[in-house]
């Protein structure tokens, strides 16, 4: 297993609809054809794999299970979007990238993006 640098933004604020997007960029040492991206959440004394996708370079990301994530890839960048977030989902979201094929296997883990989610205030009753 060889180490690889992964960069991601330090802070992202989710939209009022609970959607957060950020870019995960990795310094690929070679020409990987198969890449696996995992988003981990570290908060509340838990480490959770939020979503994971394996993709062939140039193709769409295919996420596993009932994923709350979507994403696209462009070169050594992965554009990730997490949906359905609520205030209690605020936490550190870490991007983990694995170059699966061809060998050698490379692993890179980012420092994490602190995603802040603020639940929208309910609209006040109107007389109009």
């Amino acid at each position: 297993c060889k180490a690889m640098h992964v960069a991601q933004p330090a802070v992202v604020l989710a939209s009022s609809r609970g959607i957060a997007s950020f870019v995960c960029e990795y310094a690929s040492p070679g020409k990987a054809t198969e890449v696996r991206v995992t988003v981990l959440r570290q908060a509340d004394s838990q480490v959770t794999e939020v979503c994971a996708a394996t993709y062939m370079m140039g193709n769409e990301l295919t996420f596993l299970d009932d994923s709350i994530c979507t994403g696209t890839s462009s070169g050594n960048q992965v554009n990730l979007t997490i949906q359905g977030l609520r205030a209690m989902d605020t936490g550190l979201y870490i991007c983990k990238v694995e170059l699966m094929y061809p060998p050698p296997y490379y692993l890179g883990i980012g420092n994490g993006t602190q995603i802040y989610v603020i639940d929208p205030e309910p609209c006040p009753d109107s007389d109009f």
Epitope: R41, T48, E49, V50, L64, D65, I82, M88, D89
Partner: nanobody, 125 residues
Framework: EVQLVESGGGLVQAGDSLRLSCAAS????????MGWFRRAPGKEREFVAA????????SYADSVVGRFTISRDNAKKMVYLQMRSLKPEDTDVYYC??????????????????WGQGTQVTVSS
């Protein structure tokens, strides 16, 4: 409805390993998130680990990361908790639980609908 039966608990020495099993009944097992929780006498039930319906995604309490591994076999309707490098503070009753909800960044106790009876794990120093 899902019935859950845990097994594999026992008395071990600190540093030893143990594998807990949870047998589930019900035809829709593969659509449930499965989790392991633990509770010591007089304490709140505590999250240990969870696994998504397909087994692709997992979640762990910080206190067990790197020591415990959760896995599942949907064909056999089984969930496992492999526990390594056990510590006296791991002594607890361990419960298997099932939740029919989408995978979340924040698996929580309140989302679980079905619970087993528990299996005792005792780690002596």
């Amino acid at each position: 409805e899902v019935q859950l039966v845990e097994s594999g608990g026992g008395l071990v020495q600190a540093g030893d390993s143990l594998r807990l099993s949870c047998a589930a009944s019900g035809r829709t097992f593969s659509s449930y998130i499965m989790g392991w929780f633990r509770r010591a006498p007089g304490k709140e039930r505590e999250f240990v680990a969870a696994i998504s319906s397909s087994g692709a995604l997992t979640s762990y309490a910080d206190s067990v990361v790197g020591r415990f591994t959760i896995s599942r076999d949907n064909a056999k309707k089984m969930v496992y908790l492999q526990m390594r490098s056990l510590k006296p503070e791991d002594t607890d009753v361990y419960y298997c639980a099932a939740a029919r909800v989408p995978w979340s960044p924040r698996p929580s106790l309140s989302t679980y609908d079905y619970w087993g009876q528990g299996t005792q794990v005792t780690v002596s120093s």
